[in-house]
């Protein structure tokens, strides 16, 4: 499911519960995705020892994965709500091609990979409603994404395993950083 249990507007199981605010819904959605990533990481970590490797050992890769930096305004120092929100949405849009790549990378967690992908789409929609400056958000070029996907899928098995691990780790870190920032807003 792309939305955590109890989040669907049609859910009437708890009629006395206060409806979630926009911020609470976003918070819960991120936590839901992080739980999904955790499940996917369990499968990849069981298959290889990459999870124990230091970041430096895995740093030499050609992936251009979104990453939070001081200039993005999401850290405690230099915090800027609007700049940060634009970075979060832009970063999530950039991650979408990598989440598409993950779709055929899991045996026992195939549904979980799909749930992470769909939940991220929903999260982007939630965040776009919250953002005031949508013009500042750049959408990745579909043609560039298509050729990147082809290139990633053409890698040998070891590189594909490495790519899977790096995507999951980077996406986890990006979401955790986003959550910390959103909780300050």
């Amino acid at each position: 499911a792309p939305v955590p249990p109890g989040e669907d507007s049609k859910d009437v199981a708890a009629p006395h519960r206060q409806p979630l605010t926009s911020s609470e819904r976003i918070d819960k959605q991120i936590r839901y995705i992080l739980d999904g990533i955790s499940a996917l990481r369990k499968e990849t970590c069981n298959k290889s020892n990459m999870c124990e490797s230091s970041k430096e050992a895995l740093a030499e890769n050609n992936l251009n994965l979104p990453k939070m930096a001081e200039k993005d305004g999401c850290f405690q120092s230099g915090f800027n709500e609007e700049t940060c929100l634009v970075k979060i949405i832009t970063g999530l849009l950039e991650f979408e091609v990598y989440l598409e790549y993950l779709q055929n990378r899991f045996e026992s967690s195939e549904e979980q990979a799909r749930a992470v992908q769909m939940s991220t789409k929903v999260l982007i929609q939630f965040l776009q409603k919250k953002a005031k400056n949508l013009d500042a958000i750049t959408t990745p070029d579909p043609t560039t994404n298509a050729s990147l996907l082809t290139k990633l899928q053409a890698q040998n098995q070891w590189l594909q395993d490495m790519t899977t691990h790096l995507i999951l780790r980077s996406f986890k870190e990006f979401l955790q950083s986003s959550l910390r920032a959103l909780r300050q807003m």
Epitope: R41, E52, S54, Q76, E173, Q176, S177, R180, R183, Q184
Partner: antibody, heavy 120, light 110 residues
Framework: EVQLVESGGGLVQPGGSLRLSCAAS????????VTWVRQAPGKGLEWVGI???????AYATWAIGRFTISRDNSKNTLYLQMNSLRAEDTAVYYC??????????????WGQGTLVTVSS | AIQMTQSPSSLSASVGDRVTITCQAS??????LSWYQQKPGKAPKLLIY???TLASGVPSRFSGSGSGTDFTLTISSLQPEDFATYYC????????????FGGGTKVEIK
């Protein structure tokens, strides 16, 4: 053995500076969030600050501007730079590791602590 | 800024007693709360995280409950090695806070 070992504590004069170290062994520090917590004699635990996997940091309001957390991944060591020290900074300083697998901060591995005394 | 208030600050109990310590957050922190045990001259030890999940190697006589703003640590049958100071800690947000920990509860022998 998986452990954290703090060092660098000692006697320092008010207004002085000190750099504490936290050396990790048995695991790669760069894969984890690491925090500093202090405890004044006979008092409770006081959170100082944290460094996340991306070198993002956060500090307690009272520590901003005086304390800085950094790390050297090649040495597998974390640092706490403390400037403009005051008598009330006298405490045992602990570093602690968060496994960073989740979104909430929780500290499941602690060092033995190093004592910092600020006095003239 | 989130503040953590722990009560009582100290209590006296006997071996075999059921002990309850409470912790209150100044705003909702979901279930993002941990409990630690500290003995004199030693580093704190994680007992419970996510409000109710027992950390590895912690005896089942320790349990945690709560969500939102109100949390409880319970020791079902106090053992001699349980006399120590207990702290709660919020892990929800470490920004714009003075302290992530509660003030502590010292459990003493009656």
């Amino acid at each position: 053995e998986v452990q954290l070992v703090e060092s660098g504590g000692g006697l320092v004069q008010p207004g002085g500076s000190l750099r504490l170290s936290c050396a990790a062994s048995g695991f790669s520090l760069s894969n984890y969030y690491v925090t500093w917590v202090r405890q004044a004699p006979g008092k409770g635990l006081e959170w100082v600050g944290i460094i996340y996997g991306s070198d993002e940091t956060a500090y307690a309001t009272w520590a901003i501007g005086r304390f800085t957390i950094s790390r050297d991944n090649s040495k597998n060591t974390l640092y706490l730079q403390m400037n403009s020290l005051r008598a009330e900074d006298t405490a045992v300083y602990y570093c602690a590791r968060d496994d960073s697998s989740d979104w909430d901060a929780k500290f499941n591995l602690w060092g033995q602590g190093t004592l910092v005394t600020v006095s003239s | 800024a989130i503040q953590m208030t722990q009560s009582p600050s100290s209590l006296s109990a006997s071996v075999g007693d059921r002990v309850t310590i409470t912790c209150q957050a100044s705003q909702s922190i979901n279930n993002e709360l941990s409990w630690y045990q500290q003995k004199p001259g030693k580093a704190p030890k994680l007992l419970i995280y996510r409000a109710s999940t027992l950390a590895s190697g912690v005896p089942s006589r320790f349990s945690g409950s709560g969500s939102g703003t109100d949390f409880t640590l319970t020791i079902s049958s106090l053992q001699p090695e349980d006399f120590a100071t207990y702290y709660c800690q919020q892990g929800y947000s470490l920004r714009n806070i003075d302290n992530a920990f509660g003030g502590g509860t010292k459990v003493e022998i009656k």
